[in-house]
């Protein structure tokens, strides 16, 4: 009997009520592997979740977060509210970055400004709540005749949670 069930492909289940016949998964359910005795209920993306990929007979739905929220956890199991740049999300809500720290993302916590002097450089552009300082050449490099190219501000591309 087990051998008959192992022949049932993904998208079907082995129907015990019908002599191990492979029956298609009912609507709003799926089986991603063969030989299943039941189909799993499709995930529903409701509330702060929105559908990224519809459920099919062989794969579950995939959810994303609506605007103003971001995913956390494997398969986006949770949506957490965004903050503004220059803020961090604490357990009590969004809070402005303290002086000397910044956050250029809508998530995460505020990061200390770069200390340019540790690498023998000087501050070219001061930091803000939203942006890190920009380090320039060391003071010794700024003597007359020394060329100095202005480095770009440290932009970050939108990040992703570790999923």
């Amino acid at each position: 009997l087990q051998d008959l069930c192992s022949n049932c492909p993904a998208g079907t289940f082995c129907d015990n009520n019908r002599s191990q016949i492979c029956s298609p998964c009912p609507p709003n359910s799926f089986s991603s592997a063969g030989g299943q005795r039941t189909c799993d209920i499709c995930r529903q993306c409701k509330g702060v979740f929105k559908t990224r990929k519809e459920c099919s007979s062989t794969s579950n739905a995939e959810c994303d977060c609506i605007s103003g929220y971001h995913c956390l956890g494997a398969e986006c199991s949770m949506c957490e509210q965004d903050c503004k740049q220059g803020q961090e999300l604490t357990k009590k809500g969004c809070k402005d970055c303290c002086f000397g720290t910044f956050n250029d993302q809508k998530r995460g916590i505020c990061r200390p400004w770069t200390n340019c002097s540790l690498d023998g450089k000087s501050v070219l552009v001061n930091g803000t709540k939203e942006r890190d300082v920009v380090c320039g050449p060391s003071p010794a490099d700024l003597s007359p005749g020394a060329s100095s190219a202005t480095p770009p501000a440290p932009a970050r591309e939108p990040g992703h949670s570790p999923q």
Epitope: L72, N103, Q105, C110, P112, D132, P152, P158, G159, S161
Partner: antibody, heavy 120, light 110 residues
Framework: QVQLVQSGAEVKKPGASVKVSCKAS????????MHWVRQAPGQGLEWMGW????????NYAQKFQGRVTMTRDTSISTAYMELSRLRSDDTAVYYC?????????????WGQGTLVTVSS | SYVLTQPPSVSVAPGETARITCGGD??????VHWYQKKPDQAPVLVVY???YRPSGIPERISGSNSGNTATLTLSRVEAGDEADYYC????????????FGGGTQLIILG
């Protein structure tokens, strides 16, 4: 897929310097901060610092300030960690690890580690 | 700088539940991350931001955090779970932002 591949093991004498490399692939190197963490034999994990590969901005643990320098070469998607004035207690496995897009979360991808042995 | 305190070891029989604690002042106000470290292997992130699992980490691994203690829970432990586990936080207010606990060796009995 994301990969961080580090340079091979090194044996150094006390007082010397070592430079460990970490080549990134499978993602946009300049978009994600890189951290360095070490583990001495029989000891725990110890955070050393980070570098923003886009700007070159760094932050070092106070313990290593003045001895560590983190740099990068964006043209070859490689981060470097140089530790100078080596002592025997710097013998450790050194890891690079990627921060996944924002500060305050866990480090999601790690290099395989580079063993640095400091011995006279 | 901020200090995280872990027990040196935790022993548990296969199939049982292991709980590894990480203590710190008002740690419940911080986001705690957990790494599994096996000999001669790189650390692996198993829980981030107190309770979230990266893809590929089994559901029997979970985390919680409140007050002065964060906890990593491994249910139905297997021989392959034997490893060192480290908690970690970021402390932007200090001169040492990245802080790890001392690590806990999970010993599977039998």
């Amino acid at each position: 897929q994301v990969q961080l591949v580090q340079s091979g093991a090194e044996v150094k004498k006390p007082g010397a310097s070592v430079k460990v490399s970490c080549k990134a692939s499978g993602y946009t190197f300049t978009g994600y901060y890189m951290h360095w963490v070490r583990q001495a034999p029989g000891q725990g994990l110890e955070w050393m610092g980070w570098i923003n590969p886009n700007s070159g901005g760094t932050n070092y643990a106070q313990k290593f300030q003045g001895r560590v320098t983190m740099t990068r070469d964006t043209s070859i998607s490689t981060a470097y960690m140089e530790l100078s004035r080596l002592r025997s207690d710097d013998t450790a496995v050194y890891y690079c690890a990627r921060e996944p897009g924002y500060y305050g979360t866990g480090l999601d991808y790690w290099g395989q580690g580079t063993l640095v042995t400091v011995s006279s | 700088s901020y200090v995280l305190t872990q027990p040196p070891s935790v022993s548990v029989a296969p199939g049982e539940t292991a709980r590894i604690t990480c203590g710190g002042d008002d740690i419940g106000d911080k986001r705690v991350h957990w790494y599994q470290k096996k000999p001669d292997q790189a650390p692996v992130l198993v829980v981030y931001e107190d309770r979230y699992r990266p893809s590929g980490i089994p559901e029997r691994i979970s985390g919680s955090n409140s007050g002065n203690t964060a906890t990593l829970t491994l249910s139905r432990v297997e021989a392959g779970d034997e490893a060192d586990y480290y908690c970690q936080v970021w402390d932007s207010s200090s001169d040492h932002p990245g802080v790890f606990g001392g690590g806990t060796q999970l010993i599977i009995l039998g």
